[in-house]
């Protein structure tokens, strides 16, 4: 008799792939543009990234530090009208991209939550949730919740409103905290909350703490669905040197949970390489003309256009990983088992029932190392085969699709491998 298939878990749309944050419409579109109508024209690009949701804004009216002049129900006219927003929603829906609206109230001001008028602001948020849910948004994001007094109880209330409308609606909270205990206390009081934090940004510029941070987090959160990012808003390049970007992309797409990226992460957008650009929201480099301030500052391989034409680029890697993440059961909701492989190496398996399985080996070291895969660390349900097929490497030069002997697996400096192998009874 064939073994019984394992029952599939309930999957919400945000479980099926990455979220893509566009916190600054003007920086994203560039060239003095930056409105909802223009963003609609970029939805095909988002489709090409295979992302499942767009985290947008904030785009509401907000006079810096003035609670009376902050209206969460009104779109700032600089970004467009309610009609523009409705049109964007419709277009996004047609392309199966969900829209999450950021309602962080005082986004232009000093304290995101007008600390002296918390109750007033909380009421405004409540009204806004109901209003925008009726308008058809798929979820909400609120950031800087470490500045919100009694954040846990407010989040629980907002979560009730969101889920009360539909189980298919999402609430994301963001915090600058990297403290695991603080993060856990926020999660404990809010069952389905998706939380973005600076937790992984403590992994160090060499990535030396990544493995322990990830495993600690997963052990602490148990079966709870998590999200993976390095911060609540900033670019990966704010935290990582160039040589770790590919490793982190591979890791974020293959850990159990929802990967969350900021616009530009897919091309390695780096504010430090663009003099005069703000660290938190540099201009998106669509092509070499996107940053005309300093002629020659932008080369083709830094842009969407240039990287789209290069199969070995960071953007091409992002697209491939995003595609795998959204269609393979083992990556969608599979079990996760980390195991020893050697100094500087982080290796883990993702597997679901009798589906194809995935082995990830990440070399955070700046040296070529043989991976001593300690299969004895793994449960019987997740045993390693003698060989696995190379699906992709973060570095060019390997023959993809070829079987690799796991006993003789050697990684280049800062190389990550994604390997696949079939279930064996």
């Amino acid at each position: 008799r064939a073994p019984r298939c394992r029952e599939l878990p309930a999957q919400k749309w945000w479980h099926t792939g990455a979220l893509y944050r566009i916190g600054d419409l003007q920086a994203f579109q560039g060239h003095g543009a930056g409105n909802l109508a223009g963003l609609k024209g970029r939805l095909d690009y988002l489709s090409s990234l295979k992302v499942k949701g767009l985290v947008l804004g904030p785009i509401h009216k907000n006079q810096k530090d003035d609670v009376a002049q902050t209206d969460l129900l009104q779109i700032d006219p600089n970004f467009g009208s309610k009609e523009d927003f409705d049109s964007l929603l419709q277009s996004a829906k047609k392309k199966s991209i969900r829209v999450i609206l950021d309602l962080t109230p005082n986004y232009r001001g000093e304290n995101s939550w007008f600390s002296t008028q918390v109750d007033t602001v909380a009421t405004k948020v409540k009204d806004a949730l109901e209003f925008w849910l009726q308008a058809g948004v798929d979820g909400f994001q609120v950031r800087d919740i470490e500045n919100l007094k009694d954040a846990s109880s407010f989040l629980a209330e907002w979560q009730n409103i969101t889920k009360g409308f539909s189980e298919d609606r999402l609430l994301i909270a963001g915090t600058n905290s990297s403290d695991l205990q603080q993060i856990l206390s926020l999660l404990e009081s809010n069952k389905d909350l998706l939380l973005t934090s600076s937790y992984l940004s403590d992994s160090g510029s060499t990535g030396e703490h990544t493995k322990s941070l990830v495993t600690q987090y997963l052990n602490a959160t148990g079966n709870r669905w998590c999200s993976w990012s390095l911060s609540q808003a900033r670019l990966l390049t704010s935290f990582l040197p160039a040589q770790l970007l590919r490793l982190y992309q591979l890791m974020l797409f293959t850990l159990p949970g929802t990967p969350v990226f900021s616009y530009g992460d897919e091309i390695g957008l780096d504010a430090a390489a663009l003099p005069g650009q703000p660290m938190e929201a540099p201009v998106m480099l669509w092509d070499e003309s996107s940053f005309p301030d300093i002629p020659g500052a932008v080369s083709a391989n830094m842009t969407v256009k240039g990287q789209s034409e290069d199969p070995g680029s960071l953007l091409s890697l992002f697209r491939r990983l995003s595609d795998q993440r959204s269609k393979e059961r083992s990556l969608l909701h599979g079990d996760f088992h980390a195991f020893s492989a050697g100094p500087g190496l982080f290796s883990y398996i993702r597997h679901w029932d009798q589906n194809e399985r995935f082995l990830v080996v990440l070399n955070f070291g700046d040296v070529g190392l043989s991976a001593g895969l300690q299969a004895s660390d793994l449960p019987a349900s997740a045993s390693l085969p003698a060989k696995a097929d190379l699906l992709l490497s973060t570095q060019p030069g390997r023959e993809e699709g070829s079987p690799l002997e796991l006993e003789r697996l050697k990684l280049e400096p800062h190389e990550g491998l994604l390997l696949r192998f079939p279930y064996a009874a």
Epitope: G204, E208, P343, G365, D366, V367, Q395, E412
Partner: antibody
Amino acid sequence: QVQLQQPGAELVRPGASVKLSCKASGYTFTSYWMNWVRQRPGQGLEWIGLIDPSDSETHYNQMFKDRATLTVDKSSSTAYMQLSSLTSADPAVYYCARASYGKGYFDYWGQGTTLTVSS
Amino acid sequence: DIVMTQSPSSLAMSVGQKVTMSCKSSQSLLNNINQKNYLAWYQQKPGQSPKLLVYFASTRESGVPDRFIGSGSGTDFTLTINTVQAEDLADYFCQQHYSSPFTFGGGTKLEIK
């Protein structure tokens, strides 16, 4: 300042084992890799292996894989190398050497332990 | 394993002269991703442990006098000592730090005339 302290000498019998120590001070022990290198009389340098003190993950030169065992004691910031089945080919100066996380070059070295194998 | 070959095995120079020594690797030490060459140079004075001089082929370790200059790429590397001093009497070893097992050259012994 960074220091790696090793005993000056060890005398052991052929076929026996020896456990060499390397006490680190002046830096965060768990933030750097510890390597072991040997130098036989009048010869060059041979890399034996490395250990990451943060999680005790090890990596060995295949030539020493079956005979060398690297360990650490985080509480005393001490690294150890045990070498078993000693023969007349093993007398050498054994150095511990620090490397930044993920790097393969060695920025600080101990003074070395002179190992003598004699019956 | 990557084999490292140094030449000459020894050389004698007078104080103030310029010294060059060579190191060759059996395969390229250039990482095409970051365009760095993974080669280090060490100095070992008599009765002492080795001391790091240069890594990534040309990056001088802090505190090392600027008369020590590392150069080269791919498989061919050179350590140059401009205006050699009496205290430079030592053995000099190159080492590849590209890939495990890390391997050293046989050394060049510098004697002062």
